[in-house]
């Protein structure tokens, strides 16, 4: 069986300030079991944007129903974009662990650029 891949098809997305940005992410397998998280940036300074397992992320909606059986689409939409949202977003698969989940594989990233709101 092929190892899971995290696919972020768009290298970049450009959105006007105030609009919503859709960031696409798909998995090639349901295994290993574990949550998906989205981050802005990489390394220690990365910002948690969405955690499938816990938390309240009011500006983020999932494009498909993540709890649906056999779902492999983990795309998200971020509303009301501002210049501070610009950056590279990574879709990251975690493997279920105890006590903490372990990062398993990351997508290649999608760079979000924010255009000035048209006047």
């Amino acid at each position: 069986e092929d190892e899971l891949q995290v696919i972020q098809p768009e290298k970049s997305v450009s959105v006007a300030a105030g609009e919503s940005a859709t960031l696409r992410c798909a998995m090639t397998s349901l295994i290993p079991v574990g949550p998906i998280m989205w981050f802005r940036g990489a390394g220690a300074g990365r910002e948690l944007i969405y955690n499938q397992k816990e938390g309240h992320f009011p500006r983020v909606t999932t494009v498909s129903e993540l709890t649906k059986r056999n779902n492999l689409d983990f795309s998200i939409s971020i509303s009301n974009i501002t210049p501070a949202d610009a950056g590279t977003y990574y879709c990251v698969k975690f493997r279920k662990g105890s006590p903490d989940d372990v990062e398993f594989k990351s997508g290649a990233g999608t760079e979000l650029s924010v255009r000035a709101k048209p006047s």
């Epitope: 105030g18 220690a44 300074g45 910002e47 948690l48 992320f57 983020v60 501070a84 709101k117």
Partner: antibody
Framework: DVQLVESGGGVVRPGESLRLSCAAS????????MNWVRQAPGEGLEWVSR????????DYAESVKGRFTISRDNSENTLYLQMNSLRAEDTAVYYC????????????WGLGALVTVSS | ETVLTQSPATLSVSPGERATLSCRAS??????LAWHQQKPGQAPRLLIY???RRATGIPDRFSGSGSGTDFTLTISSLQTEDSAVYYC??????????FGGGTKVEIK
């Protein structure tokens, strides 16, 4: 209910150090960025520092850069502010504040801890 | 760096009357503006976010409006317990997070 409780305030001399703590409860602490905001006697609110959800990304106001260090322990649901080389102008009530999302306003505030720097 | 200017510095209003507070940004902040209330000796409390959305548990006499650079907080029928300092906060550009200088609302 979200609760933020600061401790560690007190009276110190110029040049001395102090560490503030903020115990958080009632929300998924590890999913949210946290901030310190201060208020000098009779003055307005001044943002001091921010730390991202994972603890690896930090930002500081110019007035405290190089002297203050923000950190967090997600296993203990606690936020810290290490204050070194304290000055008279650092005298203030220090509030810890939860951020609504990674790029957002402060939706919950602690009761504050008074720090007095005086010779 | 975005500067927020609040006016007036002090507002004296009779109970039951309308209070209108202004916050002006030096550059556009879209709708990314919040209002916080601070009563004497207490911590700040979030009232309004995204310029016009009331936070949980905030009475409907508080309303926010505006976008871009000009924002207004309105207290439609002032109650004695509304005596406080009100601060606006922008979160469109950061760091740093910026607050306005505050408007003190007094009861006549």
């Amino acid at each position: 209910d979200v609760q933020l409780v600061e401790s560690g305030g007190g009276v110190v001399r110029p040049g001395e150090s102090l560490r503030l703590s903020c115990a958080a409860s009632g929300f998924s602490f590890s999913s949210y960025a946290m901030n310190w905001v201060r208020q000098a006697p009779g003055e307005g609110l001044e943002w001091v520092s921010r730390i991202n959800s994972g603890g690896g990304g930090t930002d500081y106001a110019e007035s405290v850069k190089g002297r203050f260090t923000i950190s967090r322990d997600n296993s203990e649901n606690t936020l810290y502010l290490q204050m070194n080389s304290l000055r008279a102008e650092d005298t203030a009530v220090y509030y810890c504040a939860k951020q609504y999302d990674w790029n957002g306003f402060f939706d919950y505030w602690g009761l504050g801890a008074l720090v007095t720097v005086s010779s | 760096e975005t500067v927020l200017t609040q006016s007036p510095a002090t507002l004296s209003v009779s109970p039951g009357e309308r209070a209108t507070l202004s916050c002006r940004a030096s550059q556009t902040v879209g709708s990314k503006l919040a209002w916080h209330q601070q009563k004497p000796g207490q911590a700040p409390r979030l009232l309004i976010y995204d310029a016009s959305r009331r936070a949980t548990g905030i009475p409907d006499r508080f309303s926010g409006s505006g976008s871009g650079t000009d924002f207004t907080l309105t207290i439609s029928s002032l109650q004695t317990e509304d005596s406080a300092v009100y601060y606006c906060q922008q979160y469109y550009y950061w760091p740093p997070y910026r607050f306005g200088g505050g408007t003190k609302v007094e009861i006549k």
